[in-house]
Interface confidence: low
């Protein structure tokens, strides 16, 4: 059986986020009347027992007993990374190493490349970049709640030689459903501890108009007032509405925004009505067939695409 060396100090490796605080704890079972000491990767003594050896206000004594020496380093910088040594000056000197790893926090991503006023079926290409991560972060894309598959994250070393800049691009064909959608680039990194660090770009998609005719009331009778609403959609929203009646001289006069009004419905109003909604992206005509019967029956109506 190997006998345990009770005078051998022990410690542990630590990981800390840049700007955070790390505690280095060194313990020993049998101190043999000797003091514990902490030194940094440059072999500068930080504390010998409870005595401060290095003038750095970031380094504070947490605990000093014959069996333990604990110190804290606040506002940790990337330059603080490395092997810290705990020593006890017995015969012979015994040491324990603590590897301190400093994580670089990725900056909020920046999205570039957005081209405004995309038209339906054009391809949008966006670029995302985040600097300052260590180790290199990962970038992910999404459109609303839907994941987008960008290209593989590219990694480039920052000028400081310690952190990394990561970048990724995504391309997709836009549809009218994408108008007003938020394209989000998120950075994933262990230093964030699950917190969301993302940037979004709202996109605008121009698309041709569509229209639909809606009667008000839904079931008008002879003698009633009827409004035929022409409801246009599109980006830009249709600004011009023209009503025609098949077999009549065009156009009919609108009296209320995009609606056609019948103050007093007659059987002679029966027929097929067309509403053309126009924007600078194009035109769309919706049709509505109105059958005006006696005061009791319900008119049959339909609307057709052209």
């Amino acid at each position: 059986n190997l006998s345990q060396d009770d005078s051998q100090p022990w410690t542990s490796d630590e990981t800390v986020v840049a700007g955070g605080t790390v505690v280095l704890k060194c313990q020993v079972k049998d101190h043999e009347d000797s003091s514990l000491q902490w030194s940094n990767p440059a072999q500068q003594t930080l504390y010998f027992g409870e005595k401060r050896a290095l003038r750095d206000n970031r380094i504070q004594l947490v605990s000093s007993t014959p069996h333990e020496l604990s110190i804290s380093i606040s506002n940790v910088a990337l330059a603080d990374e490395g092997e810290y040594t705990c020593s006890i000056f017995t015969m012979p000197v015994r040491t324990a190493k603590s590897l301190v790893t400093v994580l670089g926090i990725p900056q909020k991503p920046i999205i570039t490349g957005y081209k405004s006023s995309l038209r339906e079926k054009e391809t949008a290409t966006l670029n995302c970049q985040s600097s300052g991560s260590k180790p290199a972060a990962q970038l992910t894309w999404r459109k609303g709640d839907q994941e987008l598959h960008g290209d593989q994250t590219r990694i480039q070393e920052d000028p400081n030689g310690k952190t990394f800049t990561v970048s990724s691009s995504v391309s997709f064909q836009v549809t009218r459903e994408d108008d007003g959608a938020n394209i989000v680039c998120s950075v994933n990194h262990e230093s964030l501890k699950g917190a969301d660090r993302s940037t979004s770009q709202r996109i605008e998609v121009l698309y041709t108009p569509t229209a639909m005719i809606r009667p008000e009331p839904a079931h008008p009778r002879e003698g009633q007032k009827l409004l035929l609403h022409c409801e246009g959609r599109g980006n830009p929203v249709p600004q011009q509405y023209v009503w025609v009646k098949e077999g009549s001289e065009p156009p009919l006069k609108m009296t209320q925004e995009s609606a056609l009004i019948f103050p007093f419905l007659n059987k002679s109003d029966s027929g097929t009505y067309g509403c053309t909604a126009t924007s600078n992206m194009g035109s769309y005509t919706a049709y509505f067939t109105l059958n005006v019967n006696d005061p009791s029956p319900v008119p049959s109506s339909s609307s057709t695409y052209h």
């Epitope: 509505f288 339909s302 609307s303």
Partner: nanobody
């Protein structure tokens, strides 16, 4: 849990007929519009027909006009699509959809609830 279940699809010869049904559960759909869309292999989903909450107003795509008829039976919470004079280009998965408002809509973004679809194959 909102559910739309389509049925009635299948294999039919050109010139034949099919009647698709769309049954709704999980919400009172009788007060809402309903639409049929279809998606052929390798193509985008396209509008076929829509019907308003009362059944008084219907809309058809050009490709469906004169051949397809949309109707509804609110007592059964069901909407139908009667398809006549079917052609090979009508082959697609047909989807039933319902919006979260009364107003019928003519493109997919106006609909919030979708069925799983039923396959219609027109072939000799």
């Amino acid at each position: 849990q909102v559910q739309l279940v389509e049925s009635g699809g299948g294999l039919v010869q050109p010139g034949g007929s099919l009647r698709l049904s769309c049954a709704a559960s999980g919400r009172t759909f009788s007060n809402y519009a309903r639409g049929w869309f279809r998606q052929a292999p390798g193509k985008e989903r396209e509008f076929v027909a829509a019907i308003d909450y009362s059944g008084g107003s219907t809309n058809y795509a050009d490709s469906a006009k004169g051949r397809f008829t949309i109707s509804r039976d609110n007592s059964k919470n069901t909407v139908y699509l009667q398809m006549n004079s079917l052609r090979a280009e009508d082959t697609a998965v047909y989807y039933c959809a319902a919006p979260a408002s009364r107003r019928p809509s003519w493109d997919a973004d106006g609909y919030d609830y979708w069925g799983q679809g039923t396959l219609v194959t027109v072939s000799s």
